[in-house]
């Protein structure tokens, strides 16, 4: 290690951040590049092919210049130096500009969401106070699974207006607890749309829909596909009658046969009278035999 070589050799003092610096040894970079110069010319760093370890030197210089965290003017131009930052570094930042966020997400494009990116997004969203539409647009463009990575508590800060930015694929990995939070927001966001347009928009969120909303949809000839039906909450599907399910699914009702062993279809069949199931003509088995009395125990509990 050449730690003792701290003085900058004659004629090597950097006047600007340029390509000549790629030929400097690490100790020469340390000795010959002024941190303030680096900070003011950060936009040049990304265009210069510094090595992995040369970047460590540049980062160290910035860390010494800004021990409390980098200003946004520097952060915006970090480029691939961002890949050298730790979550601890990023927690010191105050990122308020969407352009800065985009610039840093671009650096990580095509890779999994790293701990650094997750921390950056967390800092940005917390700074804004809510997940607004422009931010959500940006984040889901880079990470389609972003929304489903948030906890139900974090999702509660999403304003209904932001829901317009959500695409069906953004919800692919969401679990029922997340959809429980998102569905009411979507219902509010799309409330002024007409029947068929409303259904197209709300369909991806229906995993959070209560029974009464499913009953209402069944009256609107929506022809829900089986994939959507299979994602509905079991507790929301169970109270639906055979007639309601038939109306809800329309021509897709035939798909119930293939799914009769899977939730929520299996549990729903167990709650229906076999007579009623037979009216579908699909050969669904497992309903309540004719002549049996059905006791609604949930109602009994509510009365006691």
């Amino acid at each position: 290690r050449e730690v003792e070589k701290t003085a900058c050799p004659s004629g090597k003092k950097a006047r600007e951040i340029d390509e000549s610096l790629i030929f400097y040894k690490k100790w020469e970079l340390e000795a010959c590049v002024d941190a303030a110069l680096l900070a003011t010319q950060m936009d040049r760093v990304n265009a210069i092919p510094f090595t992995y370890e040369q970047l460590d030197v540049l980062k160290h210089k910035l860390d010494e210049l800004y021990p409390q965290g980098y200003p946004e003017s520097v952060i915006q131009h970090l480029g691939y130096l961002f890949l050298k930052m730790s979550p601890e570094d990023i927690r010191k930042w105050n990122v308020t500009s969407l352009e800065t966020l985009k610039a840093l997400l671009e650096v990580n494009k095509g890779h999994e969401m790293s701990p650094q990116v997750a921390t950056l997004i967390d800092r940005f969203v917390k700074g804004r106070g809510q997940l607004d539409k422009d931010t959500l647009d940006t984040l889901t463009a880079f990470y389609p699974g972003y929304l489903c990575s948030l906890s139900p508590e974090e999702l509660s800060s999403v304003p209904p207006s932001s829901i317009w930015a959500v695409r069906p694929q953004d919800l692919d990995t969401c679990d029922p607890r997340q959809l429980d939070v998102l569905y009411p927001k979507a219902r509010l966001a799309f409330q002024n749309m007409n029947g068929s347009e409303y259904f197209v928009k709300i369909q991806s969120f229906l995993g959070g829909a209560p029974t009464e909303d499913l009953k209402a949809l069944s009256q609107q000839n929506v022809s829900m596909d089986l994939a959507t039906f299979m994602k509905l909450r079991t507790d929301a599907v169970l109270p639906l009658t055979v007639a309601e399910v038939q109306k809800l699914l329309g021509p897709h009702v035939e798909g119930l046969k293939a799914e009769e062993r899977h939730r929520p279809v299996r549990d729903w069949i167990l709650r229906q009278r076999q007579d009623d199931l037979d009216t579908l003509g699909l050969g669904l088995q497992g309903g309540i035999p004719n002549g049996y009395l059905v006791l609604d125990l949930s109602m009994q509990e509510a009365l006691s």
Epitope: F23, Y24, K25, A47, P49, F50, T51, E53, Y80, V107
Partner: nanobody, 119 residues
């Protein structure tokens, strides 16, 4: 250790093109900067082109700017040099090099591939 093997050199007429390849083995070079150097008979070895570890930025010697293009394929551990509009003065042995530190220290080198441009 990183082993570098160059290929693609040969004899070409002035104005022609060649594409050099450099395959790295021994360890992944995804965090290494890669470069092409060249050495003409009786001259010092000089840098031709550099590409950084992300593939996002490059450097070219003035003499090859606009004619040569360096690129890399990290999953394949390979770096390329596309050489167009070749001139007799491009005749040299071309070496592939890799470093995580700087080009003046801790640099791995290939054996070289001969490029000859006839007029």
């Amino acid at each position: 250790q990183v082993q570098l093997v160059e290929s693609g050199g040969g004899l070409v007429q002035a104005g022609g093109s060649l594409r050099l390849s450099c395959a790295a083995s021994g360890r992944t070079v995804s965090t290494y900067n890669m470069a092409w150097f060249r050495q003409a008979p009786g001259k010092e070895r000089e840098i031709v082109a550099v590409i950084n570890w992300t593939g996002g930025s490059t450097y070219y010697a003035e003499s090859v700017k606009g004619r040569f293009t360096i690129s890399r394929d990290n999953p394949k551990n390979t770096v390329y040099l596309q050489m167009n509009s070749l001139k007799p003065e491009d005749t040299a042995v071309y070496y592939c090099a890799a470093t995580r530190t700087s080009w003046t220290e801790n640099t791995y080198w290939g054996q070289g591939t001969q490029v000859t441009v006839s007029s």
